[in-house]
């Protein structure tokens, strides 16, 4: 095959090599860019900047090599359009620094930066961490900072990401209230900060105020849906990014629903309870307190992380006719109480003539307005239904 006279020549089925001295000053309009998986560039002293627009359309790129060239600056978002990039070799260029944002979001198996006049500063703390943690083949390169010695020896005591403190109201928040949150940002070289409110949806009307170092956020006319939703403050500096999430607890009264008993491996009387704070629960059987045992007990589904409602079962193992009757679930919190009842029949009574048949669970009388009981919200509730679990 005749030698390729162009600045860039095909290499294999989806590669491109650009090695003719000084032929490139940018990477615009590379031939066949959309299918490239490998791009090799060498001896391009006029190629000094790598920016977002340079790699647009190179969505399939896996390996990028730019060596022995004049690269001085790589934009933080340069690789936004190359999410599949796994090998990046920028050795023997004129790079003094490289932002942590440049490699964020990439799954780099290899990052080569040897032979660059790196300048040791907090902006390279992320690279020093890669070296410490053995990532991307960095330790083997024994990177040096120009005139400053090994990168590994760079002092890093003052190289921290921003520190965030989010102030939330101490007092109880009710439905319809306005809530002011404040995010206090501290740290060196602060660049950007803001709020992430993607979970809020219709939970409140949002108004942002202020800027670095103190960001304000007003959540107006809050609803009970705001519970369990993350409100996140974030900030960035040259070392990295910090995020802190908080949740606002909006008080609302207890509510409860009961459903018809269903037979699984065991019997289940399904229920749902809601309220903030989490309501206490109590079961009654024919008007008397039902004392839980391994034969009849409350079992909760794994809670959804972003809602207050809890679903579960009154679990009945081996119920007989003596368990037939009226089941009532009482739920109460400081803002109100609720109850729901359902009739359940598990088995016909084979001894209709004997109403004194023994009952295999213990009961005691109760005032139906009672609000004591176990709190619903427990950190480690039974994930039943995932496996068959009995008692």
């Amino acid at each position: 095959a005749a030698p390729c006279p162009d600045a860039c020549c095909p290499h294999g089925s989806s590669g491109l090599r650009c090695t003719r001295d000084g032929a490139l000053d940018s990477l615009h309009h590379l031939p066949g860019a959309e299918n490239l998986t490998e791009l090799y560039i060498e001896n391009q002293q006029h190629l000094q900047h790598l920016e977002l627009r340079d790699l647009r359309g190179l969505g399939e790129l896996r390996n990028l090599t730019i060596v022995k060239s004049g690269l001085r600056f790589v934009a933080p978002d340069a690789f936004h359009f190359t999410p599949r990039l796994s090998r990046l070799n920028l050795s023997f260029n004129a790079l003094e620094s490289l932002s942590w944002k440049t490699v964020q979001g990439l799954s780099l198996q290899e990052l080569v930066l040897s032979g660059n006049p790196l300048h040791c500063s907090c902006a390279l703390r992320w690279l020093q961490r890669w070296e410490e943690e053995g990532l991307g083949g960095v330790p083997e390169q024994k990177l040096q900072c120009h005139g400053q010695g090994p990168l590994a020896h760079m002092p890093n005591a003052s190289c921290g990401v921003p520190t965030l403190k989010v102030q939330v109201p101490n007092a109880s928040v009710d439905v319809g209230d306005d809530v002011l949150l404040r995010c206090q940002v501290e740290g060196r070289g602060l660049e950007q900060a803001g709020w992430i409110l993607t979970e809020l949806e219709q939970s409140a009307t949002v108004m942002k105020s202020g800027g670095l170092p103190s960001l304000g956020l007003t959540l107006a006319n809050v609803t009970s849906d705001l519970n369990r939703k993350n409100v996140t403050c974030w900030a960035e500096n040259d070392v990295g990014r910090a995020e802190v999430s908080v949740q606002v607890n909006v008080s609302f009264p207890a509510s409860v629903q009961l459903h018809t008993a269903v037979e699984m491996h065991h019997w289940c009387i399904p229920f749902s309870v809601d309220g903030q704070p989490a309501p206490s629960l109590r079961w009654l059987f024919n008007g008397s307190v039902l004392n839980e045992t391994s034969f009849i007990f409350t079992e909760f589904l794994e809670p959804a992380a972003n809602e207050t409602v809890r679903h579960g079962c009154l679990r009945l193992n081996q119920p007989t006719h003596v368990n037939n009757g009226n089941y009532t679930l009482l739920a109460a919190n400081p803002f109100g109480q609720a109850s729901a009842s359902i009739m359940a029949a598990f088995m016909d009574n084979p001894f209709e003539f004997n109403p004194e048949d023994p009952i295999p669970v213990s009961f005691s009388p109760v005032d139906t307005n009672s609000t004591s009981g176990d709190p619903v919200e427990k950190k480690d509730e039974t994930p039943f239904g995932v496996s068959v679990a009995v008692g």
Epitope: H265, E292, T293, S294, F295, F297, F300, N317, Q318, T320, F351, D357, P358, I359, P360, V361, S362, D374, K378, D380, E381, T382, P383, F384, V386, S387, V388, A389, V390, G391
Partner: antibody, heavy 118, light 107 residues
Framework: QVQLQQPGAELVKPGASVKLSCKAS????????MHWVKQRPGQGLEWIGE????????NYDEKFKTKATLTIDKSSRTAYIQLSSLTSEDSAVYYC???????????WGQGTLVTVSA | DIQMTQSPASLSATVGETVTITCRAS??????VAWYQQKQGKSPQLLVH???TLAEGVPSRFSGSGSGTQFSLKINGLHPEDFGSYYC?????????FGAGTKLELK
Amino acid sequence: QVQLQQPGAELVKPGASVKLSCKASGYTFTSYWMHWVKQRPGQGLEWIGEINPNNGLTNYDEKFKTKATLTIDKSSRTAYIQLSSLTSEDSAVYYCAKYGNYVAFAFWGQGTLVTVSA
Amino acid sequence: DIQMTQSPASLSATVGETVTITCRASENIYSYVAWYQQKQGKSPQLLVHNAKTLAEGVPSRFSGSGSGTQFSLKINGLHPEDFGSYYCQHHYGIPLTFGAGTKLELK
């Protein structure tokens, strides 16, 4: 596989207390009540009580209400039984046990032999 | 509380023989009975639950029967490893109670 690990033996003095452990593995600890069973040398099995690992709720046989206290440490997946005011009558093997897919003891610990002796 | 009366207290038999152990409940417990085998110095092993359902891995020479108040465990053709103690237990609410046990010895 399901395992309930218990220490082999405890020697205690009359009048003292002892706390026995049962470390669970191989299943969802919070999905099953834990039970304790006593067996005196050459004698039969006696059910002491049960505990719900989710909330610490307990039920005891009347006979053991003042003798035994059941507790749970969810973080270490361990159930405990504390026996108080020990006498020679409390010398026995103490088993922890759990139900399988039915309400019967499909899984047992190896048992801890408690000897009460001056 | 439900009492479980087990008989006989002891039983001598030879390898290959068929034996039956019985248990009487003090009240109707439907079919909520389990049977356990225990060897000297070992933990009990579940043989049967719900009166007649064999537990996993239990040989078919073991069988349970009965309902209401009368229950039995039958071993068809004893093997050498079958000698030991056997206990019935009701699983019909708490407190759970066991029979006093049957010691099966080699004649």
